[in-house]
């Protein structure tokens, strides 16, 4: 398929609430209408979707409801937010960019942000 | 083992319709992205066109568009062409074929083919 | 589109020959090229993809080589079910998905 340039951070330090936000950029070759933004999960040597949304260039992104992603977009960025992250989840997170429509189909994957989410420390109890 | 079964071709009238299907085992059908390919007598392997593993998107040949219509089922593993106002340039044996979608690299190429149908359009 | 120009329409051979079949691309397909075979009456069989890798259940003796637009389908030694018609096909720039018209492998 015909390969795009995608950019995304190196690094981002999930909230301690669990939130990690980073930006998605993709050098479009041509008008799309309609792009497909996949956030993959690279652990060892497997590769998994975490999330997948589409738009329509000028709209804003459908994520499923039950989806853990958010996100906007504004011409050539998207604005990805991933919630609900502990520190299990650390790990390489992939931007992957689809345009669909028009043809031809265009894909590109970024290098990968390495998010880092560290559990907060549970609240000692205090005696008064 | 893998099996791709096509169905439904035959002899119709230029103007009139047609439903091809295509029964999918020994695979995950809902993981691959399925195409029809024609192949007129005597002729080359002509691309007609891809419904997306999950169906959420289709691409057709010029040749085809406004025509035919690809569609699925994964709960039934069946692919479908509906091919309206036939001519009889169509007259082809008609193959579908799968192409795994790499979650890195998009559609691939295809690796598993039916055996075929005919269809001829002749009035 | 991108057309795909195959050479030679057909090339005969003794068994036992090395066979060497050409596909052409009207521009760069990169790496995303993929030679079948067909036998009458038959579908068509994936032999190479992305140029170079053999797909399953392919004997060692069918190599594929090239990037761009220039690309080689070698049969090392020509075995009897050999004999068939040879695609190449792209998958760089789609839709449409673009084969070339094919090369008639026969015995000589």
């Known amino acids: 398929c015909k390969a795009m340039h995608v950019a995304q951070p190196a690094v981002v330090l999930a909230s301690s609430r669990g939130i990690a936000s980073f930006v998605c950029e993709y050098a479009s070759p041509g008008k799309a209408t309609e792009v497909r933004v996949t956030v993959l999960r690279q652990a060892d040597s497997q590769v998994t979707e975490v999330c997948a949304a589409t738009y329509m260039m000028g709209n804003e992104l459908t994520f499923l409801d039950d989806s853990i992603c958010t996100g906007t977009s504004s011409g050539n960025q998207v604005n990805l937010t991933i919630q609900g992250l502990r520190a299990m989840d650390t790990g390489l997170y992939i931007c992957k960019v689809e345009l669909m429509y028009p043809p031809p189909y265009y894909l590109g994957i970024g290098n990968g942000t390495q998010i880092y989410v560290i559990d907060p420390e549970p609240c000692p109890d205090s005696d008064f | 083992q893998v099996q791709l079964v096509e169905s439904g071709g035959g002899v119709v009238q230029p103007g009139r319709s047609l439903r091809l299907s295509c029964a999918a085992s020994g695979f995950t059908f809902s993981s691959y992205g399925m195409h029809w390919v024609r192949q007129a007598p005597g002729k080359g392997l002509e691309w007609v066109a891809l419904i997306w593993y999950d169906g959420s998107y289709t691409y057709y040949a010029d040749s085809v568009k406004g025509r035919f219509t690809i569609s699925r089922d994964n709960s039934k593993n069946t692919l479908y062409l509906q091919m309206n106002s036939l001519r009889a340039e169509d007259t082809a044996v008609y193959y579908c074929a799968s192409a795994y979608y790499d979650i890195l690299t998009g559609p691939y190429y295809f690796d598993y083919w039916g055996q075929g149908t005919l269809v001829t359009v002749s009035s | 589109e991108i057309v795909l120009t195959q050479s030679p329409a057909t090339l005969s051979l003794s068994p036992g020959e090395r066979a060497t079949l050409s596909c052409r691309a009207s521009?760069?397909?990169?790496?995303?090229l993929a030679w079948y075979q067909q036998k009458p009456g038959q579908a068509p069989r994936l032999l190479i993809y992305?140029?170079?890798n053999r797909a399953t259940g392919i004997p060692a003796r069918f190599s594929g080589s090239g990037s761009g637009t220039d690309f080689t389908l070698t049969i090392s030694s020509l075995e009897p079910e050999d004999f068939a018609v040879y695609y190449c096909q792209q998958r760089s720039n789609w839709p449409p998905y673009t084969f070339g018209q094919g090369t008639k492998l026969e015995i000589k």
């Open positions: 992305d140029a170079s």
């Open positions: 521009q760069s397909v990169s790496s995303y």
